[in-house]
Interface confidence: low
């Protein structure tokens, strides 16, 4: 048993059928010595008396808010949550496996630049009685600070018969060094509590591996005289690290016909302009990627040829 | 322009060669995300590599003040990786395919290090750790880890030279 936060405790249970569970001793936070009784949740049934209560925690029916009273007055509370381990593996029932980039990916994170700011998100089908708290650090043995905000519900989607809820959190490395080569990964830890079930999820990454620039901005076409060619120009996204002479991007320019089956013409360039042939009903799209490190491409920025 | 403590490198040449190094490092190990190497207990193998750290002056401001600190650190790293790529880790079994980019990568590391340190000019180099994996699969894993680490190193080096070519060239 360990303390998650004040008056909230997590009991770790090997979840085998009829496992005897864990013996837990609760102590009433009071100078009083006698006349103390204990109840669980909203029930008025007295579970025991005295300053301490010894319980055998086996299953969710044994978890909950234990309260000690004296003469009708509440003295203190202890909330017991369960963390289940089945077949030697901690349960992962609360979050959905996103399966990208590999199985057992519960947390996904992205950064728009090298400033040390990143966003993580996760999915669940649970709509109520759900809380998350997020902690992060750079490295684990001698951790350096990363500050995370509160996790918020960022999207709701319908998937077949189920509703899926996306939660996200923003974190910022306290003393980020954008130009340095990372040697210690960022660690992100999410505590999830659903009703009386506790679970924790972790992710470990380098900022350089989760970089995904925003799409290029101000995408414009300039027709070239007496030609089907156009000059496409764009700018670095505002959110990208500066100076651009140091934090450089490379770009992919694509000409795509109306039909998905039509051949796509692609040009790669380090410049912020390119000359392409604009076909009728086609569109021109540009996306960006770090020039020197192959992390994710941005989403496409697009304009119609007409 | 001249920089305190040494002459200015051929920024444009260094830029071109470092960008080529980036391309080669990724073609030698494109499996980004397919193998999470941090799960494979790599502490004893790749945390001895020289990293370009915050105090090494490789940021835009540090380069403007005195690029020599940063260039020395990059040179150390290039020599270190050049030795690793020429070691038993890459030459031993399982042998690399004949058209593997590792050979080119090795030569380019040497080329860039020579651009940074002409004959008769000596910077301290870092000792290469004695890594002698006994099993072919361990060697394979070590190669992946070294290449992943090299990708991060040459990305920073390429940024330095790109910025230098754009702002510090005579």
């Amino acid at each position: 048993i360990w303390e998650l936060k004040k008056d909230v405790y997590v009991v770790e249970l090997d979840w085998y059928p009829d496992a005897p569970g864990e013996m837990v001793v609760l102590t009433c936070d009071t100078p009083e010595e006698d006349g103390i009784t204990w109840t669980l949740d909203q029930s008025s049934e007295v579970l025991g008396s005295g300053k301490t209560l010894t319980i055998q925690v086996k299953e969710f029916g044994d978890a909950g808010q234990y309260t000690c009273h004296k003469g009708g007055e509440v003295l203190s509370h202890s909330l017991l949550l369960l963390h289940k381990k089945e077949d030697g593996i901690w349960s992962t029932d609360i979050l959905k496996d996103q399966k990208e980039p590999k199985n057992k990916t519960f947390l996904r994170c992205e950064a728009k630049n090298y400033s040390g700011r990143f966003t993580c998100w996760w999915l669940t089908t649970i709509s109520t009685d759900l809380t998350f708290s997020v902690k992060s650090s750079r490295g684990s043995s001698d951790p350096q600070g990363v500050t995370c905000g509160a996790a918020t519900l960022s999207a709701e989607r319908v998937r077949g018969d189920n509703k899926e809820y996306e939660y996200s959190v923003e974190c910022q490395e306290d003393s980020a060094c954008p130009a340095a080569e990372e040697s210690l990964p960022i660690e992100v830890m999410v505590d999830a509590v659903h009703k009386l079930k506790y679970e924790n999820y972790t992710s470990s990454f380098f900022i350089r591996d989760i970089i995904k620039p925003d799409p290029p901005k101000n995408l414009q076409l300039k027709p070239l005289k007496n030609s089907r060619q156009v000059e496409v120009s764009w700018e670095y996204p505002d959110t990208w690290s500066t100076p651009h002479s140091y934090f450089s991007l490379t770009f992919c320019v694509q000409v795509q016909g109306k039909s998905k089956r039509e051949k796509k013409d692609r040009v790669f360039t380090d410049k912020t302009s390119a000359t392409v042939i604009c076909r009728k009903n086609a569109s021109i799209s540009v996306r960006a990627q770090d020039r020197y490190y192959s992390s994710s491409w941005s989403e496409w920025a697009s304009v119609p040829c007409s | 322009r001249a920089v305190p403590g040494g002459s200015s490198p051929a920024w444009t040449q260094c830029q071109q060669l470092s960008q080529k190094l980036c391309t080669l490092a990724w073609s030698a190990h494109p499996l980004v995300g397919h193998m999470d190497l941090r799960e494979e207990g790599d502490e004893e193998t790749t945390n001895d590599v020289p990293h370009i750290q915050c105090g090494d002056g490789c940021d835009p401001q540090g380069l403007r003040d005195n690029s020599q600190f940063c260039l020395q650190r990059i040179h150390q790293g290039l020599i270190f990786y050049e030795k690793l790529l020429g070691s038993d880790i890459f030459t031993g079994e399982p042998s690399l395919l004949p058209d593997s980019p590792v050979g080119q990568l090795h030569a380019s590391l040497l080329g860039l290090s020579q651009l940074l340190q002409p004959e008769g000019h000596h910077w301290e180099t870092q000792q290469i750790p004695s890594l002698s994996p006994s099993q072919p699969w361990q060697r394979l894993l070590l190669r992946f880890k070294i290449l992943r680490s090299l990708q991060a190193f040459v990305a920073v080096a390429a940024r330095v030279f790109a910025h230098g070519a754009a702002t510090l060239s005579p």
């Epitope: 090997d14 059928p17 009829d18 077949d87 029932d93 | -």
Partner: antibody, heavy 114, light 112 residues
């Protein structure tokens, strides 16, 4: 008082499917996994699979290779076991048993016969 | 899968006499938490199985103290100190150390 009440006996033709229900009462249905066990005439008990009613997650005995599906309707506190592609050797009494195997349903006889 | 081998197949006993049923597991049921994940059941004629012993030696609620369980990780025993007429039926051991859970073939206890 804890109780598991199963649906009545079924007679099925080979190749058909059967769906047996198990209604729970006297406890919080979502707190406990539900197991399904069967017993062919004169044979040992055979565990088929288990479901976590809170999340719908299942673990099956690979012997039944995709033929068994365990589901729950939490609003009705009921677990279901469906067995498809029935053959004569599936003739058995099918039991639901709450986590810990301390509480069992009364059993449902499924007869597979042409 | 873990194979549970039960002996004897049939056990005729005189009321008041002790009885012992053995169960051997193909793999240790002693888990790293120090617990042995074995259940014993009694199935009386025409009834569902009832849990007698869990975790090798803990009696389920309402089970008389004449029933006891013991053993190592692989060799397990159910003992009845003094058999009574109501104890007739088929006794099964079951491992719940890993999926799929498996049962022994059963021991039929009869009154002589």
């Amino acid at each position: 008082e804890f109780q598991l009440v199963q649906s009545g006996a079924e007679v099925k033709k080979p190749g058909a499917s059967v769906k047996v229900s198990c209604k729970a009462s006297g406890y919080t249905f979502t707190d406990h996994n539900m197991n399904w066990v069967r017993q062919a005439p004169g044979q040992r008990l055979e565990w088929m699979g288990v479901i976590n009613p809170n999340y719908g997650t299942t673990t099956y005995n690979q012997k039944f290779k995709g033929r068994v599906t365990i589901t729950v309707d939490t609003s009705a506190s009921t677990a279901y076991m469906e067995l498809s592609s029935l053959r004569s050797e599936d003739t058995a009494v099918y039991y639901c048993a709450r986590r810990g195997f301390a509480y069992w349903g009364q059993g449902t006889l499924v007869t597979v016969s042409s | 899968d873990i194979v549970m081998t039960q002996t004897p197949l049939s056990l005729p006993v005189t009321p008041g006499e002790p009885a012992s049923i053995s169960c051997r597991s193909s793999k240790s049921l002693l888990y790293k938490d120090g617990k042995t994940y074995l259940n014993w059941f009694l199935q009386k004629p025409g009834q569902s199985p009832q849990l007698l012993i869990y975790l090798m030696q803990t009696r389920a609620s309402g089970v008389p103290d004449r029933f006891s369980g013991s053993g190592s990780g692989t060799d397990l025993t159910l003992k009845i100190s003094r058999v009574e007429a109501e104890d007739v039926g088929v006794y099964y051991c079951q491992q719940i150390a890993e999926y799929p859970f498996t049962f022994g073939s059963g021991t039929k206890l009869e009154i002589k």
